[in-house]
C-alpha cells in the first residue's frame, strides 16, 4: 500500500561534508517497525546510501561503517549524511516501509537534491 | 500562486550599501533555495550566489565573497540580499528565484539598482 | 568552475521557422542543464529543465535534448512572442552556471 513521504526539495551541505533533513512520513496505522533507506538518483541511475530498522520510540541504528545517522520522532525521521563531496551532489530520496504490524505499507518522496561544495584548499604558509 | 516579489528601485552613491528584499508566497519556503542573480544593462545573467533555506547554509560565487551577505527570515518568508562597497559596475537589476531540484523555477521581478554619484 | 557557452550569440528568424540554440559545458554536466527564456525588461523564465523536461505551461514547439557536454534547444515553428534571449544554465554543481545567452530576433 502507499504512504505519503515528504522531505525538503533543496539542500546545501555545510562546509564539512555534512547535510541533514527531515524524512515525514504520513501512517495510516500505528507501526512498531519501520525500515528507512536513503536513495542517491544521479546519471539515471538509482544507488542505496543507507538503510536502517528501528522501533519506534528507538534509535535509528546503521550499519558501522555507514555514512548515515538518524534519529526518529513520531512520524519523521531526521537523517544526516557525512562525508560528503562535490561529486556526491545529487537526489537523496527517502523510502519508508511499515514493516510491522501488518498491512505493510510503502512511500518514497520526491528527493532532497543536495549540492555539496568541496572546501578550498588552505593557503600555503611558510 | 507562487511567487516571489522584490523591493523597489533604489538609488545609492558609490561605496554604499544595497539590501534588497525577496518575499515568497505560495509554497513551503523552508524547502527550497534562493538564488541571487544580477543583470548589467545590456548584459547576460550572472549568478552571486544561493542560500539554502532549510538549513541556512549558503554558497557565494568567488566574484562576491566579502562584499554580499544572503540572509532569509523563515518567520516572514523572506529572503535578502546586501551588496556592500558599491561601484559603478554593479549598477544592474538584481532577481532572487526559487531553486528547485530542477533549475531556478520562479522569479521576483527585478530590483533595479542604480549607483551614482 | 563549470564554464557553458552558446552559439549563436545572436540570430535572426521569420515566423514559422525551425530555430536550433546549442550550448556547451566545460565538463560533463550529465542531464542537468536548464533552459530559460528572457524577454526586454522581463524576469528570465524556465523553459526547460534537466535537459529535456518542459516546465508546467510552456508550449511544446520548444524541446530540448543532449547529454555530457553538448545540448540544444529547439523551438519546432517560431512564434511572435518567442523573439527573445535564451540562456543555458547547469544546475550539475555550484556555482551554478549561465551561458551567455542567445538573442532571437526577427528576421
Known amino acids: 500500500k502507499a504512504m505519503h513521504v515528504a522531505q525538503p526539495a533543496v539542500v546545501l551541505a555545510n562546509s564539512r561534508g555534512i547535510a541533514s533533513f527531515v524524512c515525514e512520513y504520513a501512517s495510516p496505522g500505528k507501526a512498531t517497525e519501520v525500515r528507512v533507506t536513503v536513495l542517491r538518483q544521479a546519471d539515471s541511475q538509482v544507488t542505496e546510501v543507507c538503510a536502517a530498522t528501528y522501533m519506534m520510540g528507538n534509535e535509528l541504528t546503521f550499519l558501522d561503517d555507514s555514512i548515515c545517522t538518524g534519529t526518529s520522532s513520531g512520524n519523521q525521521v531526521n537523517l544526516t549524511i557525512q562525508g560528503l563531496r562535490a561529486m556526491d551532489t545529487g537526489l537523496y530520496i527517502c523510502k519508508v516501509e511499515l514493516m510491522y504490524p501488518p498491512p505493510y505499507y510503502m512511500g518514497i518522496g520526491n528527493g532532497t537534491q543536495i549540492y555539496v561544495i568541496d572546501p578550498e584548499p588552505c593557503p600555503d604558509s611558510d | 500562486q507562487v511567487q516571489l516579489v522584490q523591493s523597489g528601485a533604489e538609488v545609492k552613491k558609490p561605496g554604499a550599501s544595497v539590501k534588497v528584499s525577496c518575499k515568497a508566497s505560495?509554497?513551503?519556503?523552508?524547502?527550497?533555495?534562493i538564488s541571487w542573480v544580477r543583470q548589467a544593462p545590456g548584459q547576460g545573467l550572472e549568478w552571486m550566489g544561493w542560500i539554502s533555506v532549510y538549513n541556512g547554509n549558503i554558497n557565494y560565487a568567488q566574484k562576491f565573497k566579502g562584499r554580499v551577505t544572503m540572509t532569509t527570515d523563515t518567520s516572514t518568508s523572506t529572503a535578502y540580499m546586501e551588496l556592500r562597497s558599491l561601484r559603478s559596475d554593479d549598477m544592474a537589476v538584481y532577481y532572487c528565484a526559487r531553486v528547485t531540484q530542477f533549475g531556478m523555477d520562479v522569479w521576483g521581478q527585478g530590483t533595479t539598482v542604480t549607483v551614482s554619484s | 568552475d563549470i564554464q557553458m557557452t552558446q552559439s549563436p550569440s545572436s540570430l535572426s528568424a521569420s515566423v514559422g521557422d525551425r530555430v536550433t540554440i546549442t550550448c556547451r559545458a566545460s565538463q560533463s554536466i550529465s542531464s542537468n542543464l536548464n533552459w530559460y527564456q528572457q524577454n526586454p525588461g522581463k524576469a528570465p523564465k524556465l523553459l526547460i529543465y534537466?535537459?529535456?523536461s518542459l516546465q508546467g505551461g510552456v508550449p511544446s514547439r520548444f524541446s530540448g535534448s543532449g547529454s555530457g557536454t553538448d545540448f540544444t534547444l529547439t523551438i519546432s515553428s517560431l512564434q511572435p512572442e518567442d523573439f527573445a534571449t535564451y540562456y543555458c544554465q547547469q544546475s550539475f554543481r555550484t556555482p551554478f552556471t549561465f551561458g551567455p545567452g542567445t538573442k532571437v530576433d526577427i528576421k
Open positions: 534537466t535537459t529535456s
Open positions: 505560495d509554497y513551503t519556503f523552508t524547502s527550497y533555495g
